[in-house]
């Protein structure tokens, strides 16, 4: 994360800034939600542990046509060091549990806020 470019400035961005921007975007999504987020699309639940960003991307990348989460997908793509494509799954998914995108975003937001408070930026 320390070398992530292209967040708000041309150079590398501190991990705390990157994490804070992702949190702000997820807050924005939850606050501005009117109709069912992404038409009620369902995604695989994930283990909120190590490798969380790639796992979150692997889940959310299977949602297309949802403008509300496009920026989140871009951010997670920046956080995840390897190439992720739709239909790709890792062991980080809870493969027997699907939840609505809205719930997924809320769960991810709560976890990221916890990490931020604890200073776990990497």
């Amino acid at each position: 994360l320390t070398c992530l470019g292209g967040f708000a400035s041309p150079g590398p961005v501190p991990p705390s800034t990157a994490l804070r921007e992702l949190i702000e975007e997820l807050v924005n999504i939850t606050q501005n939600q009117k109709a069912p987020l992404c038409n009620g699309s369902m995604v695989w639940s994930i283990n909120l542990t190590a490798g969380m960003y790639c796992a979150a991307l692997e889940s959310l990348i299977n949602v297309s046509g949802c403008s509300a989460i496009e920026k989140t997908q871009r951010m997670l793509s920046g956080f995840c060091p390897h190439k992720v494509s739709a239909g790709q799954f890792s062991s980080l998914h809870v493969r027997d549990t699907k939840i609505e995108v809205a719930q997924f975003v809320k769960d991810l937001l709560l976890h990221l806020k916890k990490l931020f408070r604890e200073g776990q930026f990497n």
Epitope: G65, C66, S67, A68, G78
Partner: antibody
């Protein structure tokens, strides 16, 4: 399989409006965005606008005042309406599906030819 | 709006040689470490076909002769070696900022 098919009037008189329908199959409009792109004869591609699966609409800013994009999810149809047509609006009009992230246009219709002439 | 300028407007390349097409953006098309720049091929009488997404990722089914590179404002599409079937017009397109835009196109002729 994924298919998109445009249908339009072919000939439109100057100052009149153009209506084109894009009928899709093999995917749901609630889950994918659809773009409109046009190509004047012998020239390049121009992006007109798009409608996302969740209903957000983006337009080419230079044409925004003349364009309207809508859809009917139940009929699997996307509609383009353009007002005040002039001869330089003549060309081929394509609809194209947005794929998954990063939202490049992965499937295209064959296009429908539009001629603006009196 | 981001303006994409392609060069050259046309080029002729001998069979088996390398074709290089450039696309320059008026401002960065990078976001969160990725380049939102895609390449399409269009043959006469056909709709465009997606070749490369995110500057360097080959779309499924596209031959490995095609490759893309670049970041921020400067991008390149390379076809090596060129085959007869590659005669077409190639377009870059961005979806990073504001309205999506296409480059003006580069027509490739095979000698």
């Amino acid at each position: 399989q994924v298919q998109l098919k445009e249908s339009g009037p072919g000939l439109v008189a100057p100052s009149q409006s153009l209506s084109i329908t894009c009928t899709v199959s093999g995917f749901s409009l609630t889950g994918y965005g659809v773009n409109w792109v046009r190509q004047p004869p012998g020239k390049g591609l121009e992006w007109l606008g798009m409608i996302w699966g969740d209903e957000r609409i983006d337009y080419n800013s230079a044409l925004k005042s003349r364009l309207s994009i809508t859809k009917d999810n139940s009929k699997s149809q996307v509609f383009l309406k353009m007002n005040s047509l002039q001869t330089d609006d003549t060309g081929r009009y394509f609809c194209a599906r947005d794929g998954y992230f990063p939202y490049a246009m992965d499937y295209w219709g064959q296009g429908t030819s539009v001629t603006v002439s009196s | 709006n981001i303006v994409l300028t392609q060069s050259p407007a046309s080029l002729a390349v001998s069979l088996g040689q390398r074709a290089t097409i450039s696309c320059r953006a008026s401002e960065t098309v990078d976001s969160y470490g990725k380049s939102y720049l895609h390449w399409y091929q269009q043959k006469p009488g056909q709709p465009p076909k997606l070749l490369i997404y995110l500057a360097s990722n080959l779309e499924s089914g596209v031959p490995a002769r095609f490759s893309g590179s670049g970041s921020r404002t400067d991008f390149t599409l390379i076809i090596d070696p060129v085959e007869a079937d590659d005669a077409a017009t190639y377009y870059c397109q961005q979806n990073n900022e504001g309205p999506r835009t296409f480059g003006g196109g580069t027509k490739l002729e095979i000698k």
